[in-house]
Interface confidence: low
């Protein structure tokens, strides 16, 4: 009967054991939940810098290469050109670098998108019309919305396989594209109408290693 | 054809500033960078500096740091070296080269002016 | 900065025999992008350098055969095949992988 209480205690204290043990581990997973979320927030925020360093960039080259920089006297230019000159400089200190978790396939597919995109790229300065429609093409591939033309298939199977967040960054970088060319047109047609010349304005350069 | 075509030869007196310029023609002038670089006498070859012409955006060799101002002129497709408080050391020819091709592969030093002697001379 | 090293200083040769000149960088040269920007130049008496070979061995337009280039990381070799009068020179190597580019001291091809 001892023995038997004896028993009865030890199995209390197992099962007391055992329950807070579940107790712990339930705590520890919320508190995973939550830092689960927390890193994902830090995650979309670092994003965020990365996207708003990229938009100020572009933002300083367009002002750097507008019309109306063109419109002004040396001097102001040149003090225009320094601020701009400056800001960018700045804005090159700041550096986030949100790395992506890919599998090989993703990895694959990654490269394989970014190629498709250069090959464009390149082809801007021989043929800024058709580069344009391409990658609209490219850019219907990567869009939700309803295509305003023709969608490259076998790009948007092959942005399919890139990880999500990769699926997103080639969207910007074909919408940074799409405007830098819009520009770049506008800047055209304003030189062949004033003087019936033709200009290139695509900052884009596979190999920039200086900059 | 590509052209480099740059001005002619320099005599200063030191502490005096020249400005060397590079005339480009046969090629787009915002689509490639354009370097700098000096051969002293029984000295190697020295990079400067380089403009990239589409944005005036530059980078210096330390080495000439506040020695050196490089510019460029778009409507006349030219770009500019200026050297300040020259001292006998500076006398060197002076090169400009074409850079890379902002687009992709290709320039470096692929095309050259054809030197401008700066004699710093008292 | 990157120190690039070339030898021989002077190279005598044989119209007709081949000619080899060496270049060793301090670092190696490949770009985090992939290439190697290591490139040859040809300076004839009294004349601007003239790019021969970019990229470690791709020949620049216009540029004969007989020059070839070779190497990898920080180990350089520029080949002429079949040297010709016209090859008298001072031939450079130089690095364009890392700021500031720079150049090598130089190796003078004469006849004997």
């Known amino acids: 009967m001892a023995q038997a209480k004896i028993n009865a205690k030890a199995n209390e204290g197992r099962f007391c054991r055992s329950s807070s043990m579940a107790d712990r581990s339930s705590r520890l997973l919320e508190s995973l939940d939550q830092l689960e979320l927390r890193v994902e927030a830090l995650r979309e925020a670092a994003t965020a810098v990365e996207q708003e360093k990229e938009i100020l960039l572009e933002m300083i080259h367009s002002i750097q290469n507008s019309q109306d920089m063109r419109q002004i006297s040396d001097g102001e230019r040149e003090e225009l050109n320094l601020t701009a000159n400056r800001l960018m400089g700045r804005t090159l200190t700041v550096e986030v670098s949100v790395e992506t978790i890919r599998n090989p396939q993703q990895q694959e597919s990654l490269k394989h998108a970014t190629r498709i995109i250069d090959e464009v790229v390149n082809k801007f300065l021989d043929d800024l019309g058709n580069a344009k429609s391409h990658l609209m093409s490219l850019y219907s591939a990567c869009s939700s919305e309803v295509p305003h033309g023709p969608v490259d298939q076998k790009f948007q199977s092959i942005v399919i396989g890139c990880a999500l967040e990769d699926q997103k960054k080639i969207k910007r970088r074909l919408e940074t594209l799409l405007r830098n060319i819009e520009n770049s047109d506008k800047a055209i047609k304003l030189l062949e109408h004033s003087k019936g010349a033709g200009s290139k304005t695509l900052q884009q350069n596979a190999e920039s290693r200086f900059n | 054809q590509v052209q480099l075509v740059q001005s002619g030869a320099e005599v200063k007196k030191p502490g005096a500033s020249v400005k060397v310029s590079c005339k480009a023609s046969g090629y787009s002038f915002t689509d490639y960078t354009f370097y700098w670089v000096r051969q002293a006498p029984g000295q190697r070859l020295e990079w400067i500096g380089y403009i990239d012409p589409y944005n005036a955006g530059n980078t210096y060799n330390r080495k000439f740091k506040g020695k050196v101002t490089i510019t460029v002129d778009k409507s006349a497709s030219t770009a500019y070296m200026e050297l300040n408080s020259l001292r006998s050391e500076d006398t060197a020819v002076y090169y400009c080269a074409r850079g890379y091709y902002r687009y992709g592969g290709g320039g470096d030093f692929d095309y050259w002016g054809q030197g401008t002697l700066v004699t710093v001379s008292s | 900065d990157v120190v690039m090293t070339q030898s021989p200083l002077s190279l005598p040769v044989t119209l007709g025999q081949p000619a080899s000149i060496s270049c060793r960088s301090s670092?190696?040269?490949?770009?985090?992008?992939?290439?190697?920007?290591l490139h040859w130049f040809q300076q004839r008496p009294g004349q601007s350098p003239r790019l021969l070979i970019h990229k470690v061995s791709n020949r620049f337009s216009g540029v004969p055969d007989r020059f070839s280039g070779s190497g990898s990381g920080t180990d350089f070799t520029l080949k002429i095949s079949r040297v010709e009068a016209e090859d008298v020179g001072v031939y450079y190597c130089?690095?364009?992988?890392?700021?500031?580019?720079?150049f090598g001291g130089g190796t003078k091809v004469e006849i004997k």
């Open positions: 670092q190696s040269l490949v770009h985090s992008n992939g290439n190697t920007y």
């Open positions: 130089s690095q364009n992988t890392h700021i500031p580019p720079t």
